[in-house]
């Protein structure tokens, strides 16, 4: 959470940004809020990126102005125009790329004053894991798959029954490069599993942490997955 103050004569407004992460190939949001101003035509929003000449996006007089937009953002940015009057200056970013990572500035000018705040934007790839019982294996085993990760994550297994156990000797993890030659598919197999136990497959890099749980009993298989972005907010 970053709060910036701007001073214009005697006037300053509070601008707030949130560190966030973008998933390569998907759409992202760079979050920025400011003190609302009902006079839409008097609001100017400028998004800038450190090291880039030209603007990421500009919104003024109630509409976009892409005249000064840098080429790398062409056709890829939009504000939530209907939410600007209530203080939302967040930016939609289409088809996030690795090169979009960096420090962004959200600059606001309204009839009340002006202000700005910086935002650290991380980019990578992260996806939910899915665990299945691998019936093809010679012994009962579990297969954890997640389709898109970058940078290469670490993978660890845990068990409810054998808490604290190290499963690295009885698991095998591979990383397969996807067709776009950036992200990778993660596959990890855990061998010699026992029934009536809950196993967790944890995948983590510096951007996200994902966990897939599976409970195998005589009568059913229960699954659960969750994904958490790291260092956000």
């Amino acid at each position: 959470l970053i709060i910036g103050f701007g001073i214009s004569g005697k006037h300053f407004i509070t601008v707030t940004t949130f560190t966030s992460a973008g998933n390569i190939g998907e759409d992202g949001t760079l979050s920025c809020t400011f003190e609302p101003d009902i006079k839409l035509n008097g609001i100017v929003i400028q998004w800038l990126k450190e090291g880039i000449k030209g603007l990421v996006h500009e919104f003024k007089e109630g509409k976009d102005d892409l005249s000064q937009q840098h080429e790398m953002f062409r056709g890829r940015t939009a504000v939530f125009a209907d939410q600007v009057v209530v203080g939302n200056a967040s930016l939609r970013l289409k088809n996030v790329q690795l090169t979009d990572a960096g420090t962004y500035t959200c600059y606001i000018r309204t009839s009340k004053g002006k202000g700005n705040a910086n935002l650290e934007y991380k980019t990578g790839a992260f996806s939910m894991p899915e665990i299945n019982v691998d019936y093809n294996a010679s012994s009962e085993s579990l297969r954890c798959e997640a389709p898109r990760w970058f940078p290469q994550p670490t993978v660890a297994w845990a068990s409810q029954v054998d808490q604290g156990a190290n499963f690295s000797e009885v698991s095998n993890t591979s990383f397969e490069l996807n067709s776009e030659n950036v992200t990778m598919k993660v596959v990890s197999v855990l061998y010699n599993v026992t029934i009536n136990n809950t196993y967790s497959c944890m995948i983590e890099n510096d951007i996200a942490k994902a966990t897939g749980d599976i409970k195998v009993t005589d009568s059913e298989v229960k699954r659960r997955s969750q994904l958490q972005l790291l260092n956000s907010g």
Epitope: D27, D64, R92, N95
Partner: antibody, heavy 120, light 108 residues
Amino acid sequence: QLQLQESGPGLVKPSETLSLTCTVSGGSISSSSYYWGWIRQPPGKGLEWIGNIYYSGSTYYNPSLKSRVTISVDTSKNQFSLKLSSVTAADTAVYYCAREGSYTTVLNVWGQGTMVTVSS
Amino acid sequence: EIVLTQSPGTLSLSPGERATLSCRASQSVSSSYLAWYQQKPGQAPRLLIYGASSRATGIPDRFSGSGSGTDFTLTISRLEPEDFAVYYCQQAASYPLTFGGGTKVEIK
């Protein structure tokens, strides 16, 4: 309702420059929400995006044609233009102008197209 | 650039039949940025579907789009005589904008 109309010579000699103009009517070319683009279609073949321009004059070209393409805009006439230099027979095509959403980048209004033949 | 491959090249069907056209991308494309166009002989292409599944203004509901990632489909539920044409998919995720090679839907 918005309409686009291409105009220009139907015959261009090899090595010369192809020049076309698109006139926008029923709306302003200075709209902040759109790019104005050119697309071409060789006889019996598919569509190829050439590039686009914003009303302020900023452009983006297809890398495969970038060295030969210039797109310009004249807001006072509500027109934008295409120039393609050093043409060969491979540039023979129907050339379309179109309106492109600045974020959706979908081509939602097209001109009817104009056939340009490159021949001596 | 993103390469789009359409199949089949030609689809021979009768009026009233169902048409299923495929578009495959060389890399994952967000479903928000896949469009379909219809082109009749001597005419400019016309936008049919945007965002993979949203119909453009004035497009009949017999046209529907679906898909995500690298595989997208245009379906015409019951072919009308005016639907026999060439159909193109287009990716709008990144520049340069690219089109598939087209599928011709012809009368059987």
